[in-house]
Amino acid sequence: IPTEIPTSALVKETLALLSTHRTLLIANETLRIPVPVHKNHQLCTEEIFQGIGTLESQTVQGGTVERLFKNLSLIKKYIDGQKKKCGEERRRVAQFLDYLQEFLGVMNTEWIIES
Amino acid sequence: IPTEIPTSALVKETLALLSTHRTLLIANETLRIPVPVHKNHQLCTEEIFQGIGTLESQTVQGGTVERLFKNLSLIKKYIDGQKKKCGEERRRVAQFLDYLQEFLGVMNTEWIIES
């Protein structure tokens, strides 16, 4: 799969493949994988992809299920790239404060915060 | 500050304190702090709080600016707790796939994805 495919298209295709292969994937009844308790998904990318790795190692490969795991690995690559961009640019305090304000604003409005 | 204060109220108060103390905080003209290039904030919590630590170490403490940094450390504590909850519960493959589908769905609709 060329990495040139836009990430948004990759995510859409992966959702479809996940649906298609659900029956095959859940065949292993003894396998247990960590599942986050909350819905702040971005905080849990590491655990999600560790889980995907566990699932892949237990799944018979071939056909489009292989494409599913290939897609998921490209999505991981994209997220790793985004994580790298968290710390690459050293800016002045004014810009950091504007970003921090945005971050807290997003926490305030969009995060799923338990009381 | 009691940790019993709901996180949502803590975030609101911190936003107000950030506004109040902006002038004092930007006084250091030579300090540089990593600022993420994108707006997928949850991916960057580690770098954001490292930046806050850098800023705190360079800021004269006292009065309500101290409260600002105390609040920020409580917010960090909350986020660290959320991160711990990413891997605590081991579930069946079906539940993991449901979470993965939700994660990809959120990526598809809410993440800021560059072409």
Epitope: R90, R91, R92, A94, Q95, D98, Y99, Q101, E102, G105, V106 | R32, V35, P36, V37, H38, K39, I112
Partner: antibody, heavy 119, light 107 residues
Framework: QVQLVQSGAEVKKPGASVKVSCKAS????????INWVRQAPGQGLEWIGY????????RYNQKFKGRATLTVDKSTSTAYMELSSLRSEDTAVYYC????????????WGQGTLVTVSS | DIQMTQSPSSLSASVGDRVTITCKAS??????LSWIQQKPGKAPKTLIH???RLIDGVPSRFSGSGSGQDFTLTISSLQPEDFATYYC?????????FGQGTKVEIK
């Protein structure tokens, strides 16, 4: 493709206000800051300020603080720059420009709006 | 505010010439500098960002260098479509500030 389309030319009297619009298309409006820059006839470029459509937060060049107001309408993906108490020195072409990332370079510019202040 | 001093303010050159424009910041701006091209009656266009990174679609004859306070824009072999005014912009600190511009004219 990514575009910023600005409103048409305006003629205003001294003391009046002007509101210039900048309609974004081809990308998710809330993902990028919008900057405003002006250029007086035969002169260089001058930064007015930026607005973050994500949270409506704006920052201004001190020179324009109190006179310039930056706003956005997320429902129409449009940014606005209003300048009040106009004087002849405000005669200029006003540009909107998109930040590539947070406090980053301007990767897309609007075509410009000429504002003429004359009695 | 950070002052950006550009030189020369204008220059005459021929097609094929190598052209260099410099920009000096009044304080350290790291590498947060872009170079912008503007043709008469047209909107500005960013050519280079972060001092030396060429923007997609910009011809490779344009290059930038420098960090800290001193920066350079070079056009290795001037083409007819390159006759324009060039500005440097620092986006390191608020307020962002531009150089006064360098007009590149045909000799």
């Amino acid at each position: 493709q990514v575009q910023l389309v600005q409103s048409g030319a305006e003629v205003k009297k001294p003391g009046a206000s002007v509101k210039v619009s900048c309609k974004a298309s081809g990308y998710t409006f809330t993902n990028h800051h919008i900057n405003w820059v002006r250029q007086a006839p035969g002169q260089g470029l001058e930064w007015i300020g930026y607005i973050n459509p994500y949270n409506d937060y704006s920052r201004y060049n001190q020179k324009f603080k109190g006179r310039a107001t930056l706003t956005v309408d997320k429902s129409t993906s449009t940014a606005y720059m209003e300048l009040s108490s106009l004087r002849s020195e405000d005669t200029a072409v006003y540009y909107c420009a998109r930040d590539y990332g947070n406090f980053w370079y301007f990767d897309v510019w609007g075509q410009g709006t000429l504002v003429t202040v004359s009695s | 505010d950070i002052q950006m001093t550009q030189s020369p303010s204008s220059l005459s050159a021929s097609v094929g010439d190598r052209v260099t424009i410099t920009c000096k910041a009044s304080q350290d701006i790291n590498s947060y500098l872009s170079w912008i091209q503007q043709k008469p009656g047209k909107a500005p266009k960013t050519l280079i960002h972060r001092a030396d990174r060429l923007i997609d679609g910009v011809p490779s004859r344009f290059s930038g260098s420098g960090s800290g306070q001193d920066f350079t824009l070079t056009i290795s072999s001037l083409q007819p479509e390159d006759f324009a005014t060039y500005y440097c912009l620092q986006y390191d600190d608020f307020p962002y500030t531009f150089g006064q511009g360098t007009k590149v004219e045909i000799k």
